[in-house]
């Protein structure tokens, strides 16, 4: 794949992702009400990082926010800060990225600082990603060891002792956001590799065309039973060389000395 | 103004069946649920279960899974029950009510059909 | 199922005094999701269908006159109606509005002398 292609596409997954993250932040179903093997209530329970949502047989939602900081649980607060993290480095990431990108010209940036912008981007992005992997494992740890143990109020009779009034337990499973946090995570992750392996491709590197610009001529090359040896360049002789994509050719090229191009 | 106009009262045979109607007014009939109650003579509410008009999702009582099915015309605004193999358990007033929108309540009543089974 | 179980079954009272009704359901009908009671009481008056007066255990349908209040959380409500009139004349039942299938008490009966 070329380098622009790897890099333009690596950014596209990116936003892909990045649009992801931000709708899963945003929604309501990080926990929807377990409607399995429990009594069927004609109402629908579903919390979000922001508000908790009820909806009726009618259709009739209503949802509440959460209007207080300090008495929401600290784990709930850190996966709200590990999206907003993801966020915020995300938009960071897109920015950088769209002057790093190959086919946008910008004034007289060379590739060398475009490189840089696209590793820089590259980076953003994947741990953006991670952030919002960890903040979306992190509430679906929470939900999970909730489950168990209002499962476990449920067997253990505290629900109805001797006769007494029984109390339902509403236990709270998966919801949708998770799996759209997942994803998004993943692909914003995903992307940011694109664009770090891509950065490779725009690095000046000096071993990039060495093996096709030969400086030795046939006269050079001694025949030898016990094998041939070439002059390629690689000798202790040859000064460093950089050539860059395109093969643009430096000054010490026009300096090699039987013909411009002499294979052996 | 919200009105349920329900069919008229029947005197059907043991093991017949039965198809009652409720014509809807005054409301957008696709915006509600219809929910049909029971009440025997003398005796308390049973609800027998809903038809969402829009999607056509219904929700019955599982004691009268097999013995009522809802239907509606969204054309004519109508909800239908029909009742089979009908016996003397089943002679009751029946009712259609909307279903409000908040609270899951019932907020607007038919006048009620009057079923009797008698051979 | 849930079982509703109204008491008393019937009361009889003159005009203008105070009444009180109860209702117990056998699970709590308080939605944690909401902190609602999803308790409602019907009037039905005699040859007539039910009528709605009160949704979430304690908010009056429009058009329901305010002596009507229902009250009580978890399994326990009460409906309250401050001064009886003539009219009140009717059996009051509650639903539990939460569980599937939805479920109505037996009725209390209210008779004026």
């Known amino acids: 794949m070329s380098v622009t292609a790897c890099q333009g596409l690596g950014f596209v997954v990116s936003l892909i992702g990045f649009a992801g993250i931000i709708a899963a932040t945003c929604m309501d179903q990080w926990s929807t009400q377990d409607l399995y093997n429990n009594p069927v209530t004609a109402v629908f329970n579903y919390q979000g990082l922001w508000r908790s949502c009820v909806r009726e047989s009618s259709g009739f939602t209503e949802c509440r926010g959460y209007f207080t900081l300090l008495g929401l649980p600290a784990m709930l607060q850190a996966v709200r800060a590990l999206m907003i993290v993801g966020i915020v480095l995300g938009v960071i990431g897109i920015l950088v990225s769209i002057f790093a990108l190959k086919c946008i010209r910008i004034g007289s940036m060379d590739d060398s600082a475009k490189a840089k912008m696209t590793l820089t981007s590259g980076i953003l992005f994947i741990i953006s990603g991670i952030s919002a992997i960890i903040g979306v494992s992190v509430f679906a740890n929470m939900l999970v060891t909730n489950f168990w143990m209002s499962t476990a109020n449920m067997y253990s009779g505290m629900g109805g002792m001797g006769g007494m009034v029984q109390t339902v337990q509403t236990r709270y499973t998966f919801g949708a956001a998770l799996f759209v946090g997942w994803v998004a995570g993943g692909l914003t992750l995903i992307g940011g590799v694109m664009m770090c392996i891509a950065c490779r491709g725009l690095t000046p590197d000096d071993s990039n065309f060495k093996a096709v610009s030969y400086h030795a001529s046939g006269q050079n090359v001694a025949y030898r039973p016990g094998g041939f040896k070439a002059s390629t360049g690689f000798g202790s002789n040859t000064r460093n060389k950089k050539i860059y994509d395109g093969g643009a050719r430096t000054e010490d090229d026009e300096q090699s000395h039987p013909t411009k191009y002499d294979y052996v | 103004e919200v009105r349920l106009q329900q069919s008229g009262p029947e005197l059907v045979k043991p093991g017949a069946s039965v198809k009652m109607s409720c014509k809807a007014s005054?409301?957008?009939?696709?915006?509600?649920?219809m929910h049909w109650v029971k009440q025997s003579h003398g005796k308390s509410l049973e609800w027998i279960g809903y038809i969402n008009p829009k999607n056509g999702g219904i929700r019955y009582n599982q004691k009268f899974t097999g013995k009522a099915t809802l239907t509606v015309n969204k054309s004519s605004s109508t909800a239908y029950m029909e009742l089979r193999s009908l016996t003397s358990e089943d002679s009751a007033v029946y009712y259609c009510a909307r279903g409000g929108y908040y609270g899951n309540t019932l907020d607007n009543w038919g006048q009620g059909t009057s079923v009797t089974v008698s051979s | 199922d849930i079982v509703m179980t109204q008491s008393p079954s019937s009361l009889t009272l003159t005009a203008g005094e105070k009444v009180t009704m109860s209702c117990k359901s056998s699970?709590?009908?308080?939605?944690?999701?909401?902190?609602?009671?999803?308790l409602t009481w019907y009037q039905q008056k005699p040859g007539q269908p039910p009528k709605l007066l009160i949704y979430w255990a304690s908010t009056s349908e429009s058009g329901v006159p305010d002596r009507f209040t229902g009250s009580g959380s978890g399994t326990d409500f009460t409906l309250t109606i401050s001064s009886v009139q003539a009219e009140d004349l009717a059996i009051y039942y509650c639903?539990?509005?939460?569980?599937?299938?939805?479920?109505f008490g037996g009725g209390t009966k209210l008779e004026i002398k």
């Open positions: 005054g409301y957008t009939f696709t915006d509600y649920n």
């Open positions: 639903q539990n509005a939460y569980f599937y299938p939805w479920t």
């Open positions: 699970q709590s009908l308080l939605n944690s999701g909401n902190q609602k009671n999803y």
